[in-house]
């Protein structure tokens, strides 16, 4: 039973409205039917779990309602989203896969995607 | 499947010593973060020390100068030895493997470093006296 790799993109910039979306692979070693997909951030020295689903494979992604992630999985590949960002939401985003069933259990941890998020300027009010 | 076991636990007067092993079986011993955490009641488990692949270690402040984690990879076991200990090492020690190296030298000044750790022991009790 070996680590089973996990490969994000280093870097990726929200957009002016906050949303931030990257693709989250993993190499399966087995024919698992059932994979739990966590995200966490790192910052400023503490690890928070952003959000988290479990999925039957060839099945949609289901987060919880009030969940701020969405995502969809395709084969070995989850294109998560992260909605509501503002600037001090930027951090190291790290995807966590695990393989949950058929036994044996897999775990792996991609190297983090740094999503960097900046606040839109405010418009100006205007004098018309 | 991955297994932990750690034994080596007891109780001891403060100043004493003791060593904490873990057994490990069922993946490559060799290509994790491994590491020893504790954790009291109603606190959140926080890395103790942590030993990567090529051998560097990395220790929390309040252990330095104090206890030493090594492994030997011929016998896929994982030791802390703990000296010196003081009444607040009274706590409940586990090991723990992660899947990247990436995060084990940090995970000793991060909290909710376990998130970073999937496979666990069962836990040994360390009790300190004064």
């Known amino acids: 039973c070996k680590a089973m790799h996990v490969a994000q993109p280093a870097v990726v910039l929200a957009s002016s409205r906050g949303i931030a979306s990257f693709v989250c692979e993993y190499a399966s070693p087995g024919k698992a039917t059932e994979v739990r997909v966590t995200v966490l951030r790192q910052a400023d020295s503490q690890v928070t779990e952003v959000c988290a689903a479990t999925y039957m494979m060839g099945n949609e992604l289901t987060f919880l309602d009030d969940s701020i992630c969405t995502g969809t999985s395709s084969g070995n590949q989850v294109n998560l989203t992260i909605q509501g960002l503002r600037a001090m939401d930027t951090g190291l985003y790290i995807c966590k896969v695990e393989l949950m069933y058929p036994p044996p259990y897999y775990l792996g941890i991609g190297n983090g995607t740094q999503i960097y998020v900046i606040d839109p300027e405010p418009c100006p009010d205007s004098d018309f | 499947q991955v297994h932990l076991m750690e034994s080596g636990g007891g109780s001891v007067q403060a100043g004493g010593s003791l060593r904490l092993s873990c057994a490990a079986s069922?993946?490559?011993?060799?290509?994790?973060?491994l590491g020893w955490f504790r954790q009291t009641p109603g606190k959140e488990r926080e890395a103790v020390a942590t030993?990567?692949?090529?051998?560097?270690?990395s220790y929390a402040d309040s252990v330095k100068g104090r206890f030493t984690i090594s492994n030997d990879n011929a016998k896929n076991t994982l030791y802390l030895q703990m000296n010196i200990l003081k009444p607040e090492d009274t706590a409940m020690y586990y090991c723990?493997?992660?899947?990247?190296?990436?995060?084990?030298?940090?995970?000793?000044?991060?909290?909710?470093?376990?998130?970073?750790?999937?496979?666990w022991g069962q836990g040994t009790q360390v009790t300190v006296s004064s």
């Open positions: 723990a493997a992660g899947p990247n190296p990436r995060y084990c030298s940090g995970a000793v000044y991060t909290r909710g470093a376990e998130h970073y750790f999937g496979y």
């Open positions: 069922g993946y490559t011993y060799s290509r994790y973060c």
């Open positions: 030993i990567d692949i090529d051998g560097s270690t």
